[in-house]
Amino acid sequence: MMTGTIETTGNISAEKGGSIILQCHLSSTTAQVTQVNWEQQDQLLAICNADLGWHISPSFKDRVAPGPGLGLTLQSLTVNDTGEYFCIYHTYPDGTYTGRIFLEVLESSVAEHGARFQIP
């Protein structure tokens, strides 16, 4: 039975040219995390595997940095980065948990950031 829940940074906004941390946290389960995939729509951004560590997809190598933790840092943001991002937790024995974050990249310099998220 899947008892876990994913907490995410929710809806966030950031300035064009700036950077943002995408963060998810899996709680309320003793399941072992084998891998976390970060995806934008159906495109793979990055992988964090328990055995092999981090992999950043080649198309995003210049603008994506691993961490902090299992999170992902997007840099040099453009308005095209606006959209949905998903953290997909592959766990044993529970299976797959998915969290959703919506990022809006604003032209304005008064971009209002969502609440800061910290992993306990």
Epitope: T34, N37, L44, I47, N49, D51, L52, H55, P58
Partner: antibody, heavy 120, light 116 residues
Framework: EVQLLESGGGLVQPGGSLRLSCAAS????????MSWVRQAPGKGLEWVSL????????YYADSVKGRFTISRDNSKNTLYLQMNSLRAEDTAVYYC?????????????WGQGTTVTVSS | QSVLTQPSSASGTPGQRVTISCSGT????????VSWYKYVSWYQQLPGTA?????????QRPSGVPDRFSGSQSGTSASLAISGLQSEDEAHYYC???????????FGGGTKLTVL
């Protein structure tokens, strides 16, 4: 269409060397862990070696450790297996295999295989 | 040393349900995984062809694999079930698992399925 095409097999004398290649197409090669698996005539499958996305991490079966080297060239979408100090017991069909996005889950695409015969 | 044990042969008649088992043992008690055998995959190898993935992650079926094939796992043992057996199912079947403590893949010895 996702495809793997092995080449480089042939007849070689004991103690000799051979380099196998596996050309990948139809998927983002860089995003997947890859393996070599072999099958001796009339026998079962035996895993030989695994390589991570960048080539920075490699694992080998005890039977080939120190003699075989796995590598990859992501710019050419090609996987390699350098086989040195070959023995009669290395005679087999060698398959390259693409792993599932979570590599621990299994190997979802296999090449047609290339035959290596070690004999004097 | 890790071992995945399968029966060397199995058989059934068309329409029948056949189950192939795969049990795991390990002598390295210091493996970093409590249950190293946790991710089992199954492969079908028809005569003269490359292996084909049937089941991954114990129970998941890749697209294109008929739902007559199903996987299950309990404790140190995994099973592949084939229902509504057909003559084209005659093949060798292999289980495999990643052994995290030893950083290696392990294959079972294979089961030759005969459709009578």
């Amino acid at each position: 269409e996702v495809q793997l095409l092995e080449s480089g097999g042939g007849l070689v004398q004991p103690g000799g060397s051979l380099r196998l290649s596996c050309a990948a197409s139809g998927f983002t090669f860089d995003d997947y862990v890859m393996s070599w698996v072999r099958q001796a005539p009339g026998k079962g499958l035996e895993w030989v070696s695994l390589i991570n996305w960048s080539g920075g991490t490699t694992y080998y079966a005890d039977s080939v450790k120190g003699r075989f080297t796995i590598s990859r060239d992501n710019s050419k979408n090609t996987l390699y297996l350098q086989m040195n100090s070959l023995r009669a017991e290395d005679t087999a069909v060698y398959y390259c295999a693409k792993h599932w996005i979570v590599y621990q889950y299994g190997m979802d695409v296999w090449g047609q295989g290339t035959t290596v015969t070690v004999s004097s | 040393q890790s071992v995945l044990t399968q029966p060397s042969s199995a058989s059934g008649t068309p329409g029948q349900r056949v189950t192939i088992s795969c049990s795991g043992t390990i002598s390295n008690i210091e493996t970093k995984y409590v249950s190293w055998y946790k991710y089992v995959s199954w492969y079908q190898q028809l005569p003269g062809t490359a292996p084909k993935l049937l089941i991954y992650n114990n129970v998941q079926r890749p697209s294109g694999v008929p739902d007559r094939f199903s996987g299950s796992q309990s404790g140190t043992s995994a099973s592949l079930a084939i229902s509504g057996l057909q003559s084209e199912d005659e093949a060798h079947y292999y289980c495999a698992s990643w052994e995290g403590g030893l950083n290696s893949w392990v294959f079972g010895g294979g089961t030759k399925l005969t459709v009578l």
